[in-house]
Structure formats: C-alpha cells, structure tokens
Amino acid sequence: IVGGYNCEENSVPYQVSLNSGYHFCGGSLINEQWVVSAGHCYKSRIQVRLGEHNIEVLEGNEQFINAAKIIRHPQYDRKTLNNDIMLIKLSSRAVINARVSTISLPTAPPATGTKCLISGWGNTASSGADYPDELQCLDAPVLSQAKCEASYPGKITSNMFCVGFLEGGKDSCQGDAGGPVVCNGQLQGVVSWGDGCAQKNKPGVYTKVYNYVKWIKNTIAANS
C-alpha cells in the first residue's frame, strides 16, 4: 500500500496473509473455512495466516492454517487478468474471535464514489521497494467505469473496476494482490493489477467480487 497508514492492530480481522516461506499475497476470510484471493496468487502450496498484524513477529493472535484446496476461477486469464479470483479452502476451520472474523460478500455492485478500505502488506514505495511488517490501510473511492476505462484503454473488462486517485500517490502495490477492498462492510474488490503503483492516471484495478458471488457460493457448496 502506497500512501496509506498503519492499520490499528487487528482492525481488519478478515485480512489474511498467504505465505510460501514469505508473504506473497493477501486474502479475505469469507467463512470459517474459505478465503477469497486473486487468481494470479495461485501456488500449489499455501499457508494461510490469519489474525496477523506484524507479519515478522508472533504477537499471539495468529492462526496458521494450510490450504486444503486451491481453486482458481475456471476462466482466469493470465494475459488479461480477467476473472482474477481464487478460493482457498482451509484444512481446518478458523477460530472466529475479535481478531479473526469474516467479511460479507456484496449484495450489490460497487457504486461510484463509495469510500472503501484497501489493506495489505505490500510495497509502500511507488518506486523501489519498502515492504512493511505491519498491515497498511488506505481509504480510497470507487472510480467510475468511464474513468477506469480511460486510464487503461482496452484493458478493463466488466469483471474489473478501479479504486483510487487519478492524481497518484495512493494505491495498492506488489504484495497486496488478493487482498480486500471493503466498502460499507462488504467485500467489493480483490486487489488485482495496475500500471506501476500510485502513478498519475493509473489507478489500481480490482476484481469485481459481485460478479462472482454465485460462483463462490456454488464452489463452496460443491467442496464442503
């Protein structure tokens, strides 16, 4: 997250870290046994880390649970990052408490102008690298689809939307992929891609979770 702030400890209880010996992506806990992340975060072996704030220190609230199933959307397109969404089934149920809890799926698509919370342990530098230990937060508005398409001509599908600031300076970045965009208490987006990070007229692009609610529910039902 570039241009954000240190989240209050465990204030984003649905945020998870995907770990393969290091943090490589974020994710969101949507029920006791399922996490939503980005399709491009797929790895054959993933440990899901819940209740994290400082990912380099054991603070006592963490739950480390291996992935039992990793299901990328069947129409995921590596080239365009269309359908950039993935479900992870945990090998055991998460213990839900004040520091580990679920986030609701959306009941309506994201509305232009809505203020959302984006979070992650990704790069905080728009050029170079500075990866934080503590979870970073960013408040950012949903941009209109017209502005989104104008920023990335020919690259924005109906399964994507933009959140952020056309003036640059505030954005998600490398390491934030798969993480949540939460608007009015609902998981509206999954961190997906962008041209660089926090660049002028290049806002962050996010997977539109609303378009996948049916797929998510059906996949969970078929794999329970």
């Epitope: 010996g21 290091y22 943090h23 490589f24 992506c25 980005a38 491009h40 975060c41 797929y42 590596r78 080239k79 990052l81 950039d84 990704g122 170079g128 690298a129 500075d130 990866y131 998600s172 970045c173 490398q174 390491g175 934030d176 992929a177 798969g178 961190v191 997906s192 891609w193 962008g194 990070c197 962050g204």
Partner: antibody
Framework: QVQLVQSGAEVKKPGASVKVSCKAS????????ISWVRQAPGQGLEWMGW????????NYAQKLQGRVTMTTDTSTSTAYMELRSLRSDDTAVYYC??????????????????WGQGTTVTVSS | DIQMTQSPSSVSASVGDRVTITCRAS??????LAWYQQKPGKAPKLLIY???SLQSGVPSRFSGSGSGTDFTLTISSLQPEDFATYYC?????????FGGGTKVEIK
Amino acid sequence: QVQLVQSGAEVKKPGASVKVSCKASGYTFTSYGISWVRQAPGQGLEWMGWISAYSGDTNYAQKLQGRVTMTTDTSTSTAYMELRSLRSDDTAVYYCARGDEVVGKMTYYYGMDVWGQGTTVTVSS
Amino acid sequence: DIQMTQSPSSVSASVGDRVTITCRASQGISRWLAWYQQKPGKAPKLLIYAASSLQSGVPSRFSGSGSGTDFTLTISSLQPEDFATYYCQQANSFPITFGGGTKVEIK
C-alpha cells in the same frame, strides 16, 4: 522430480553465436520464469537476464543488451539463450535457473530454486 | 543497480565451528535476499530464500537473518560437506545482482 536439463558444451570462435537450451520437467513450465546466470572461470555469478515462460517478457542485463536473446518454446517446456558476437571473455559456464513468475500485484521475488547442470561455452580462436 | 557486498571473501574453519557470512546491499531490499551454496564444478544450490526461510531439504544448521541492507548467513556447526563457496543474491528487483562470494575452507 523438478529439473532443468541443459544442452552440451560448446566451443566457438570469436564473433560467432551460441544458443544454449534448458529443458524443464516436473512442473508447469508456464507458471515460472527462467533466469540465465553465467560464471567465468574462477569468478563469481553474473546474472544475464530473465524471461517469463508464460508471456515471453524479458529483462536483460544492461551490459549484454543487444547481444543476448532469451526465448521459450512452451510446447516442449524449453528455454533458450542465444549470445551473439562472442568474445573471449564470454567463456563461462552458463546456467538456467527457475524463479517466480511476475504477475499483477503479487510479491515479486526473484530467487532461483532450481538450477540446470550448466553448459560450458568456450570462446577461442 | 543494487550492489551486494559479501564479507569475508574467504574464511578458514574447522568441522564443528560456527561460521557467519555477511552480505550488505547498497540500498534497502526489504527481506528479498537469497543465499546459495556452490561446490566446484556444480551448479549453485538454494539454501535460504526471503532472508530467513530455509529451502526444503536444507539442513537446519543453516540459518539466515536480516532485513533492509544487512543480512547474515550462519552455519551453526560446520560439517565436512559444507566446505564450499557461498553467494548472496538480491531478489528484490531487476537487474538481479550477486555478492562476490565467500569461500569456506578447511583450516
């Protein structure tokens, strides 16, 4: 098991070209990138460049720009490194190595977990 | 480009010794550092990735630490098969760069 198998040793004259192959097996070729690293006799490791096995996107070391070309053939899970206008100081062992793919906003980590056995290229008149 | 400076360039040690090798980056690279072991005539072998994560199959006597610009590889109790050259590599950004190497020799 996961492995990278490289082509055999080559002896070339100055000014010639060499093309080294690196055949991958035991994993999904297009889910990773391939780096090429060389080592001159008695010297350390020098990174030459990287190629995405999925997209073919490349990133070359500046000192080799214009002389090196990296390609992949996904149908045979093989990566290639061609070096042109060879000089005597190109004499080295050339290695291919597997690294993470670079996609979207996931963490970019350029470590190399699997290496080929190396290909000796000797440039001599 | 990010320069990687390794020290010492060589170290003489005995079986059972604790050996520490350091690597300094010319600019911050967070935790994106790898350590490799290379024996004569062989390809490098990954030991440690992301500064402190032990690669599968590597003995636990090898450990890595550090973040930002200063990193350390430690061999807690040197074994006969550990006599080799060790390289650090910044895995943060292109162009990828290696340290000059540290040769661990028998005293």
